[in-house]
């Protein structure tokens, strides 16, 4: 995840200019003590990505994202791999050598998108791994 | 990944006391401009984890770990999911709302471990997801 910044007052509206219509997305790094790895709300507007000229439908989708700390001890909710558990222990002993595991999607879902291809044909395609179903420490 | 720290002189030997015998592991965050997401060397000694009393063999194993930036544009080497590509674009536009994707294992291998169980029986067990085979942006 990105570096931590100082807390700022970011009371977002759902207007297009403001925040990609990312309803109920707070600042992902508002305090020095980050919360544990979990799934967060994120609505992605294809217009805001500049894809509105080729994507017909949907207008956007609930993508979600993963963020948070993967700190010792990793509990069951964190869907940690064996490697992540080992890496957490190594980080605990040698914090300057190895980072903590990172909070990443463990399960992703597909969405269907209707779009114009390069030849202006309308294509209905299923795009894999577009929506976060669950997050874990990896 | 963890926060960046100031560069320190850490010329590690492979001795056990010093660095968990993490041969050729440099500081994972030595400069403000992190390198791109990739696989790094990491040897894990079960002794250093305090597991020497119940693990008979091996003494340790090459676990590797993933670290580095997942910045725009994500190239083919970064094994990025569709969601990671979308998240990178959203982060580019709204850096305070959503973190960059994180560098995490995309493929993991198992190792076999010989150990004593609670009844002092010797067990040979295959532990899944112990060794990083490849890293990617998630």
């Amino acid at each position: 995840a990105a570096n931590k910044r100082k807390n700022q007052n970011r009371n977002k509206s759902s207007s297009h200019q403001d925040s990609s219509r990312m309803s109920s997305v707070g600042d992902y790094n508002t305090s020095e003590q980050k919360q544990a790895c979990k799934k967060h709300e994120l609505y992605v507007s294809f217009r805001d990505l500049g894809w509105q000229d080729w994507i017909i439908a949907p207008e956007g989708y609930a993508a979600f994202y993963c963020d948070g700390e993967c700190s010792f001890p990793l509990n069951a909710h964190m869907n940690a791999t064996n490697h992540a558990i080992v890496q957490t222990l190594v980080h605990l002993m040698f914090p300057d050598h190895v980072p903590k595991p990172c909070c990443a999607p463990t399960k992703l879902n597909a969405i269907s998108v209707l779009y114009f291809d390069d030849s202006s044909n309308v294509i209905l395609k299923k795009y894999r791994n577009m929506v976060v179903r669950s997050c874990g420490c990896h | 990944a963890a926060n960046k720290r100031k560069n320190q002189n850490r010329n590690k030997s492979s001795s056990h006391q010093d660095s968990s015998r993490m041969s050729s592991v440099g500081d994972y965050n030595t400069s403000e401009q992190k390198q791109a997401c990739k696989k790094h060397e990491l040897y894990v000694s079960f002794r250093d984890l305090g597991w020497q009393d119940w693990i008979i063999a091996p003494e340790g194993y090459a676990a590797f770990y993933c670290d580095g930036e997942c910045s725009f544009p994500l190239n083919a080497h970064m094994n990025a999911t569709n969601h990671a590509i979308v998240q990178t674009l959203v982060h580019l536009m709204f850096p305070d709302h959503v973190p960059k994707p994180c560098c995490a294992p995309t493929k993991l291998n198992a190792i076999s471990v010989l150990y004593f169980d609670d009844s002092s029986n010797v067990i040979l067990k295959k532990y899944r997801n112990m060794v990083v085979r490849s890293c990617g942006c998630h």
């Epitope: 217009r47 000229d53 439908a57 114009f116 044909n121 309308v122 | -």
Partner: antibody, heavy 121, light 108 residues
Framework: QVQLQESGPGLVKPSETLSLTCTVS????????WSWIRQPPGKGLEWIGY???????HYNPSLKSRVTISVDTSKNQFSLKMSSVTAADTAVYYC???????????????WGQGTLVTVSS | EIVLTQSPGTLSLSPGERATLSCRAS???????LAWYQQKPGQAPRLLIY???SRATGIPDRFSGSGSGTDFTLTISRLEPEDFAVYYC?????????FGGGTKVEIK
């Protein structure tokens, strides 16, 4: 139920700009694609272009250089402007709705009743 | 662009007869993205069929659509007096969206 009503001048001089407005009632314009189609007297139908309520547009390449479609969500209206008109642009101009979901994109339903625009000096 | 050719140009039939209208595309219409409309004099077109074969809401079951690829058909199983009109096909599988030239179904 949703109804569409075209309005604008019935007579436009050659080389001037044709301006029409479609008012949508019975439904919010804040979904769907909104389209313009024309039909010269005694001839077939020609799609002009469409707009999404958030402003993205798609035009028929044959008319693209002369056409602008815009939307006013506060008035539940969308508009057509066609510049440099000639007698060949004389037609009945229809506005129509296109569904904007994956399962129902691309056909026109419903239509406005149409308005005849004559280009003549 | 995809050119749609409708045939025949005019179909002269009596009430109660079966009408078969053809729409041929210059290239394949993806996913059967084809619609049919009915237009009566002085009125706007009305959607009959979408997706090549799905009837629009309120359309009688004597109207049916079929076909895929480049060849599509609209069938009216038994012509009623109110069915005499001009029929247009429209493809939305490629941009620009295009219409056929129309088939006029007239009373014999």
């Amino acid at each position: 139920q949703v109804q569409l009503q075209e309005s604008g001048p019935g007579l436009v001089k050659p080389s001037e700009t044709l301006s029409l407005t479609c008012t949508v009632s019975g439904d919010s314009i804040r979904s769907y694609y909104w389209s313009w189609i024309r039909q010269p007297p005694g001839k077939g139908l020609e799609w002009i272009g469409y707009i999404y309520y958030r402003g993205s547009t798609h035009y028929n390449p044959s008319l693209k250089s002369r056409v602008t479609i815009s939307v006013d969500t506060s008035k539940n209206q969308f508009s057509l402007k066609m510049s440099s008109v000639t007698a060949a642009d004389t037609a009945v101009y229809y506005c129509a709705r296109i569904c904007s979901s994956i399962s129902c994109w691309g056909w026109f339903d419903p239509w406005g009743q149409g308005t005849l625009v004559t280009v003549s000096s | 662009e995809i050119v749609l050719t409708q045939s025949p140009g005019t179909l002269s039939l009596s009430p109660g007869e079966r009408a078969t209208l053809s729409c041929r595309a210059s290239q394949s219409v993806s996913s059967s993205y084809l619609a049919w409309y009915q237009q009566k004099p002085g009125q706007a077109p009305r959607l009959l069929i979408y997706g090549a074969s799905s009837r629009a809401t309120g359309i009688p079951d004597r109207f049916s659509g079929s076909g895929s690829g480049t060849d599509f058909t609209l069938t009216i199983s038994r012509l009623e007096p109110e069915d005499f009109a001009v029929y247009y096909c429209q493809q939305y599988g490629s941009s620009p969206l295009t219409f056929g030239g129309g088939t006029k179904v007239e009373i014999k």
